[in-house]
């Protein structure tokens, strides 16, 4: 595959359940997959009473929902678990919530996760 400017090679890795899953807690994940398929980064988090709790971050397999997204933005209105994906190495380091609402203007809640 020809490397495009936004091809994902590495993603921020985080796993809140690292002990149960027997993984690292934080780090950088190298993304593997079929050579001709696109790779992405993702972030999942919860908003508990206004406090952001990261669930997982890492690599995400070829997904048209993530194509050409340089920023990791959740657009679904009030999901139970927030999810965003993006293209470009480490693009999941920052993630945001911009709910898509028809009438009102969306408000940005950018999040820069701090190591717990």
């Amino acid at each position: 595959a020809i490397l495009g400017r936004s091809e994902t090679q590495e993603c921020i890795f985080y796993n809140a359940n690292w002990e149960r899953d027997r993984t690292n807690r934080t780090g950088v994940e190298s993304c593997y997959g079929d050579k001709d398929k696109r790779r992405h980064c993702f972030a999942t988090w919860k908003n508990i009473s206004g406090s952001i709790e990261i669930v997982k971050q890492g690599c995400w397999l070829d997904d048209i929902n993530c194509y050409d997204r340089t920023d990791c933005i959740e657009k679904k209105d009030s999901p139970e678990v927030y999810f965003c994906c993006c293209e470009g190495s480490m693009c999941n380091e920052r993630f945001s919530y911009f709910p898509e609402m028809e009438v009102t203007q969306p408000t940005s809640n950018p999040v820069t996760p701090k190591p717990p």
């Epitope: 997982k56 397999l61 048209i64």
Partner: antibody, heavy 115, light 111 residues
Framework: QVQLVQSGAEVKKPGSSVKVSCKAS????????INWVRQAPGQGLEWMGT????????SYAQKFQGRVTITADTSTSTAYMELSSLRSEDTAVYYC????????WGQGTLVTVSS | QSALTQPRSVSGSPGQSVTISCTGT?????????VNWYQQHPGKAPKLMIY???KRESGVPDRFSGSKSGNTASLTISGLQAEDEADYYC???????????FGGGTKLTVL
């Protein structure tokens, strides 16, 4: 290598429920979707629904809305599809498949609904 | 989302080429490059052959190719071989905001 291994064949009574499992290996389970597809005897493929394995977010085909529940257990890398209020027309082979492109498939689980 | 439309059957002799069509609407096949093609032999699970309209899945022979014109996607198999005899289904990407749908399937007979 990527593998999706499904649970064994089931025989169910009309009105009951069935829960089919799909255990993934050979890749990071939380890095994609799991889709569920069924195929009635001699018929074509029918999409039932999908789950984002990391967030648990689901989407279901309108036809199955309210009757199907797809879940994922990340600790065991296993997805589940439960279909309730079974009727004879639900007799089919049920498949799980990885990702939005359905690039790897389970071997299929035959569910027979008969009184 | 309504099912995609495929011919019930097509046939060809060894060495020939055949094309299977998959017709949708301007809101699915026509506007997005997310149509896939699957091969299914009797009693087996389907196998992804082409994804994203024209990208060949790894390990799939280059005799298989995909294309799209308007609201119709097509799978072309050139240099037909006996082992190509199978059912072929078109389908769409499914996940996130996209809902899946399949065509009714096309039985390919190699004469």
């Amino acid at each position: 290598q990527v593998q999706l291994v499904q649970s064994g064949a089931e025989v169910k009574k009309p009105g009951s429920s069935v829960k089919v499992s799909c255990k993934a290996s050979g890749y990071t389970f939380t890095s994609s979707y799991i889709n569920w597809v069924r195929q009635a005897p001699g018929q074509g493929l029918e999409w039932m629904g999908t789950i984002n394995a990391v967030s648990g977010s689901t989407s279901y085909a309108q036809k199955f809305q309210g009757r199907v529940t797809i879940t994922a257990d990340t600790s065991t890398s296993t997805a589940y599809m439960e279909l309730s209020s079974l009727r004879s027309e639900d007799t089919a082979v049920y498949y799980c498949a990885r990702g939005g492109w359905f690039d790897y498939w389970g071997q299929g689980t035959l569910v027979t609904v008969s009184s | 989302q309504s099912a995609l439309t495929q011919p019930r059957s097509v046939s060809g002799s060894p060495g020939q080429s055949v094309t299977i069509s998959c017709t949708g609407t301007s809101s699915d096949v026509g506007s997005k490059n997310y149509v896939n093609w699957y091969q299914q032999h009797p009693g087996k699970a389907p196998k992804l052959m082409i994804y994203g309209v024209s990208k060949r899945e790894s390990g799939v022979p280059d005799r298989f190719s995909g294309s799209k014109s308007g609201n119709t996607a097509s799978l072309t198999i050139s240099g037909l071989q006996a082992e190509d005899e199978a059912d072929y289904y078109c389908g769409t990407f499914a996940g996130g905001k996209y809902y899946g749908v399949f065509g009714g399937g096309t039985k390919l007979t190699v004469l």
